[in-house]
């Protein structure tokens, strides 16, 4: 069988070889298509329902006015000339549709390296067969389950048309210090072969790259943070992140009831003031963190360095805040 | 939505003429064949004539051939029956319908309008 | 030409019966038979198309089945408004052709 490939939507003759030229003609098609259930015979001197499918024309071919997708299947033609010779055509018609350009809908403007990212959705309207979409990056292809690439696709039909609408959806961990601006693009390419892909309109997402969080220093006066009783000690939590963050105040993993503050001063020291002190800096994109614990005690006249003694009463003594 | 109006029936004398109009609407009339369709009184329905979307094409039954003439006007989303040398037994309803090719067949129809052939 | 021909012509049933029609076709025509309901002094309403496809809006006690040439309307369960006459049509070939009908009448 000659295969032929029919847009669908557009007409399509078939020739009958061999027949003559104008009536009288012995010929006769058969069809089996998505029409039919087995074969339909069609004459010359038809002319019928059939006819807005397919009509056997003057000359003896079959014309099919706009040819759709229940045409797709066998066509036969058996034709006897004035002499009484016999010549079969035979065909094997396949339809296609090529859809509309590609687009790439929900694109992401911006990627944060490092973590999973929804890039766009990639969506093709209108094929016949369905075909298929795949996404670039910097023009070559990506390849789902490689290197931080998933794709999630989708196929539907249109219950009248028979049409294909295909979605694609993109995701991608775009590795720290990589291209600050990559260029994604989509691309469909028939399920029928001879025709060419239709790509997207490319988008370049910035890549946003999240700097490292610095650690919180506490930094405590008198250092070692050991003093005489009725002495001072001044601790300040050093933040490197702008804008500055809220700076709160814990005292053996307990929150102090005190306005935020990057410093917090304890004067006069006395036993109730003795413990663990921490700062905790709070980013509105990064969430709470937390400094290191430093032990504030009083040394006793005559020793050198902090006791090992217990910890003092959880009163607050006198507390000031810079 | 569809829309199929009748309009043109009456009575007629044996051997007269009459010229049926179905206007159409709520759909793109120039996609579709059309076709008449008759029912005498108290009998069951019998086609009369179709016409392909363009217009080119028609199609009788014998009984009708070479006295009825379907014709379509696209612009005008008009569907004609001329009906020629009338016989008593022409007597009947005439219906329009949408459709009577293999892809759509008489979905639609409109109310009828009656046609009397007598003298 | 193609014939059909339906049966019964009449018959008399009961709300909540289940009712068959036929239409047996002189010839092959393929799937392309409908079937249609009429009331008195009303257009005909297309019910099945295609042999067994549900036309929009109807109800779905209705069904269509073929068998070769023979074409069968079900009513799965009448109801008062199904009270009608019951036309196919086999549009396959010209000329179209009618059965000749079946009227439902309350028995």
């Known amino acids: 069988a000659q295969n032929i490939t029919a847009r669908i939507g557009e007409p399509l003759v078939l020739k009958c070889k061999g027949a003559p030229k104008k009536p009288p003609q012995r010929l006769e098609w058969k069809l089996n298509t998505g029409r039919t259930e087995a074969w339909k015979v069609l004459s010359p001197q038809g002319g019928g329902p059939w006819d807005s499918v397919a009509r056997v024309l003057p000359n003896g071919s079959l014309f099919l006015p706009a040819v759709g997708i229940q045409d797709e299947g066998i066509f036969r033609c058996q034709a006897m000339n004035r002499n009484g010779k016999e010549t079969k055509s035979n065909y094997r018609v396949r339809v296609y549709q090529i859809p509309g350009k590609p687009e790439i809908v929900d694109s992401a403007s911006e990627l944060t390296a490092g973590v999973p990212n929804k890039v766009g959705t990639c969506v093709s309207e209108g094929s016949y067969p369905a075909g298929t979409l795949s996404w670039h990056l910097d023009g070559k292809p990506l390849v789902p389950n490689e290197k931080g690439v998933s794709v999630k696709e989708q196929t539907r039909r249109h219950p009248e048309t028979g049409l294909f609408t295909l979605q694609s959806e993109l995701m991608v961990t775009p590795a720290r210090g990589g291209d600050p601006r990559p260029t994604f693009s989509c691309s469909f390419s028939p399920g029928l072969p001879r025709h060419r892909a239709l790509r997207t309109a490319p988008i370049q997402p910035r890549v946003w790259e999240p700097v490292p969080l610095e650690e919180v220093q506490l930094v405590v006066e008198p250092e070692g943070g050991a003093v005489a009783p009725g002495g001072t000690v001044t601790l300040t939590c050093e933040v490197p992140a702008q804008p500055s963050p809220q700076i709160h105040w814990m005292k053996d993993g307990v929150p102090l009831p005190l306005p935020p503050s990057p410093v917090l001063i304890l004067p006069e020291i006395g036993p109730q003031d003795q413990g663990t002190y921490s700062c905790v800096a709070t980013h509105s994109s990064h969430g709470p963190q937390e400094s290191r614990a430093v032990s504030i005690s009083i040394i006793e006249p005559g020793e050198e360095g902090p006791t090992a003694g217990s910890v003092g009463g959880s009163g607050l003594g006198t507390l000031a805040l810079a | 939505e569809v829309q199929l109006v009748e309009s043109g029936g009456g009575l007629v004398q044996p051997g007269g003429s009459l010229r049926l109009s179905c206007a159409a609407s709520?759909?793109?009339?120039?996609?579709?064949?059309m076709t008449w369709v008759r029912q005498a009184p108290g009998k069951g329905l019998e086609w009369v004539a179709s016409i392909d979307n363009s217009g080119d094409n028609t199609y009788y039954p014998d009984s009708v051939k070479d006295r009825f003439t379907i014709s379509r006007d696209n612009a005008k989303n008009s569907l004609y029956l001329q009906m020629n040398s009338l016989r008593a037994e022409d007597t009947a309803v005439y219906y329009c319908?949408?459709?009577?090719?293999?892809?759509?067949?008489?979905?639609?129809w409109g109310q009828g309008t009656l046609v009397t052939v007598s003298s | 030409d193609i014939q059909m021909t339906q049966s019964p012509s009449s018959l008399s049933a009961s709300v909540g019966d289940r009712v068959t029609i036929t239409c047996r076709a002189s010839?092959?025509?393929?799937?392309?038979v409908n079937w249609f309901q009429q009331k008195p002094g009303k257009a005909p309403r297309r019910l099945i198309y295609r042999a067994t496809n549900l036309a929009d809006g109807v109800p779905s006690r209705f069904s269509g089945s073929r068998s070769g040439t023979d074409f069968t309307l079900t009513i799965s369960s009448l109801q008062p408004e199904d009270f009608a006459t019951y036309y196919c049509l086999e549009f396959d070939e010209h000329p179209l052709t009618f059965g000749g009908g079946t009227k439902v009448e309350i028995k």
């Open positions: 709520g759909f793109t009339f120039n996609n579709y064949w």
């Open positions: 319908a949408r459709g009577g090719d293999i892809i759509i067949s008489l979905d639609w």
């Open positions: 010839q092959d025509v393929g799937i392309y």
